[in-house]
């Protein structure tokens, strides 16, 4: 057995705090103003101890950050006080009022358009690198909800064929940078990210240039929380994967919830002979399970000395009051078959039920 | 080979300042969460703060509150303590930290380095 | 917060001893604990996580068990290498992550 996995089912569903309350307000600040979130007593009955969190941390008071039983003031907000907001029992943690604040200076816009931009013959016989459609990248700003795909597209044309790099904040900006990867479309003069979470935020500038000169383009990506929504998952590359017979496999999800989401690894498996239960629903064994405390959580699954029973498609799923996530990871298992393999254990380890 | 190099440590004086880093090698650094902990001369070991993979989500311990800040940058494969306001009682070895998943072990940790507070 | 407590606080015990040190939860953290051992003047190092499961390297004399609350880590004979200072650690609940107060395992 190995870091990530267990054999039996150990969730705490019994002791995560009372339901969440199902709406979120959703609120848009201007950079400058003064944030005030009010959280009046359920019912109007007594309201106890409570605690303001931002992001899962508790906010400590500050001449800035002005906290009281009922009411939370942050003076002269900036971006960085964007996020989701909670008032919470001391005692129980159970969330009684819950906001998604927004500080913005500048107004947001829809998503990106569609369409390619091949690169071009121009006929010059040199020269510096030129935009070749800039009425498409008026669009500075993009403001897409979570989730979604992104492109920035730079189409751009010179002679030489001038190359194209994308920067993050400045800084290169390579696949690794993001669980879910990039796609790099150098034809197209493209960069795309699929399933875009609040850390994809930030400038994103390219970089298009030849031996005669250098040319760039910076788009502010922000990416809305929409709220309430089931969890939002991003499989960690490669999600599907091949493996020889004794080695060691780790595949990695990461989950985005507001709400406290429910994870499990799961394997689908045979029960005799049969893939389904009568319903219909998938036979699954739970590898791994618990309540995540955080709105963010890398989950990993590690399969050591595999064998060729350890293939088949394995399921990061995660769940909250709102709905459910899954990503599927697929794992192939070939090589020389090891004597003491024959040997086929009784029982499939874990829990196994039609998930 | 997975390593966690930790520096910035040294002698400071009650109420100063140091930024301890620690380089990271070995692994895909953005797609893991890490922590700081300290072990006190003698004493056992404490943990001290936590940030997620993506650097969204931080935690500090009571101790620690409101003077530290944790940061990391996945373009230079580091992490970061900035500690502030610094007293005696944070005389310590601080290690840097690899956490395994959301719900698992410190799996690798950093050789330490000694920050002493002391006029 | 979950408060971890390792008995005993230190332990003498010779070469081919078989060892055990104790560790509660002081609420149910299912499978989430972890060991580690600690040298003097090193960092310490990942034994065993989720209650029983061996880290990579760690020899098989080193075993853990337990669930819930009470946790139990062995060494089924004890080599000159493994004198040293062992910590408990839970992950269930976080923040914070919280320690045993360690068991100094010294030769008799």
């Known amino acids: 057995e190995s870091l990530g996995t267990e054999q039996r089912v150990v969730g705490r569903a019994a002791e995560v705090p009372g339901p969440e309350p199902g709406q979120q307000e959703q609120l848009v600040f201007g950079s400058g103003d003064a944030v005030e979130l009010s959280c009046p007593p359920p019912g109007g009955g007594p309201m106890g101890p409570t605690v303001w969190v931002k992001d899962g941390t508790g906010l400590v008071p500050s001449e800035r950050v002005l906290v009281g039983p009922q009411r939370l003031q942050v003076l002269n907000a900036s971006h960085e006080d964007s996020g989701a907001y909670s008032c919470r029992q001391r005692l129980t943690q159970r969330v009684l009022c819950h906001f998604s604040v927004r500080v913005t200076d500048a107004p947001s816009s829809g998503d990106d358009e569609d369409g390619e931009d091949e690169a071009e013959d121009t006929g010059v016989d040199t020269g510096a690198p030129y935009w070749t459609r800039p009425e498409r990248m008026d669009k500075k700003l993009l403001a897409v909800p979570a989730a979604n795909t992104v492109r920035f597209r730079c189409p751009a044309a010179g002679n030489p064929t001038p190359s194209i790099s994308w920067l993050k904040n400045g800084r290169e900006f390579r696949g690794e940078h993001r669980i879910g990867g990039i796609k790099l479309r150098h034809q197209q003069w493209s960069l795309v990210m699929e399933s875009v979470v609040p850390s994809d935020r930030g400038n994103y500038t390219c970089v298009v240039e030849n031996k005669f000169g250098s040319i760039r383009q910076t788009y502010t990506l922000d990416v809305l929380e929409r709220s309430p929504h089931r969890p939002i998952l991003q499989a960690g590359l490669p999600a599907n994967q091949t493996a020889v017979l004794g080695s060691d496999v780790e595949f990695h999800c990461k989950v985005y919830s507001d709400a406290q989401p429910h994870i499990q690894w799961l394997k689908h498996v045979e029960v005799n002979g049969s893939k389904v239960g009568p319903d219909g629903t998938p036979y699954v064994t739970v590898l791994k399970s618990w309540i995540s405390e955080s709105v963010e959580a890398d989950v990993r699954l590690r399969l050591a000395n595999v064998s060729e029973r350890d293939g088949g498609e394995y399921l990061c799923r995660a769940t909250n009051f709102i709905g459910v996530a899954e990503k599927a990871f697929w794992l192939s298992v070939h090589g020389p078959r090891a004597a003491e393999e024959e040997l086929v254990e009784a029982d499939e380890a874990g829990s196994v039920y039609a998930g | 080979e997975v390593q966690l190099v930790e520096s910035g440590g040294g002698l400071v004086q009650p109420g100063g300042s140091l930024r301890l880093s620690c380089i990271v090698s070995?692994?895909?650094?953005?797609?893991?969460?890490m922590s700081w902990l300290r072990q006190a001369p003698g004493k056992g070991l404490e943990w001290i703060s936590y940030?997620?993979?993506?650097?969204?989500?931080?935690y500090y311990a009571d101790s620690v509150k409101g003077r530290f800040t944790i940061s990391r940058d996945s373009a230079k494969n580091s992490l970061y303590l900035e500690m502030n306001s610094l007293r005696a009682e944070d005389t310590a070895i601080y290690y840097c930290?690899?956490?395994?998943?959301?719900?698992?072990?410190?799996?690798?940790w950093g050789q330490g380095t000694l920050v002493t507070v002391s006029s | 917060d979950i408060q971890m407590t390792q008995s005993p606080s230190s332990l003498s015990a010779s070469v081919g001893d078989r060892v055990t040190i104790t560790c509660r939860a002081s609420?149910?953290?299912?499978?989430?604990l972890n060991w580690y051992q600690q040298k003097p003047g090193k960092a310490p190092k990942l034994l065993i996580y989720?209650?029983?499961s061996l880290q990579s390297g760690v020899p098989s004399r080193f075993s853990g068990s337990g669930s819930g609350t009470d946790f139990t880590l062995t060494i089924s004979s004890l080599q000159p290498e493994d004198f040293a200072t062992y910590y408990c650690?839970?992950?269930?609940?976080?923040?914070?992550?919280?320690f045993g107060q360690g068991t100094r395992l010294e030769i008799k």
């Open positions: 930290t690899r956490k395994w998943d959301s719900s698992g072990p410190f799996d690798f």
């Open positions: 070995g692994f895909i650094f953005s797609s893991y969460e």
């Open positions: 940030i997620s993979s993506s650097g969204r989500v931080i």
């Open positions: 609420q149910s953290i299912s499978s989430y």
């Open positions: 989720a209650a029983s």
């Open positions: 650690q839970q992950s269930y609940s976080t923040p914070p992550i919280t």
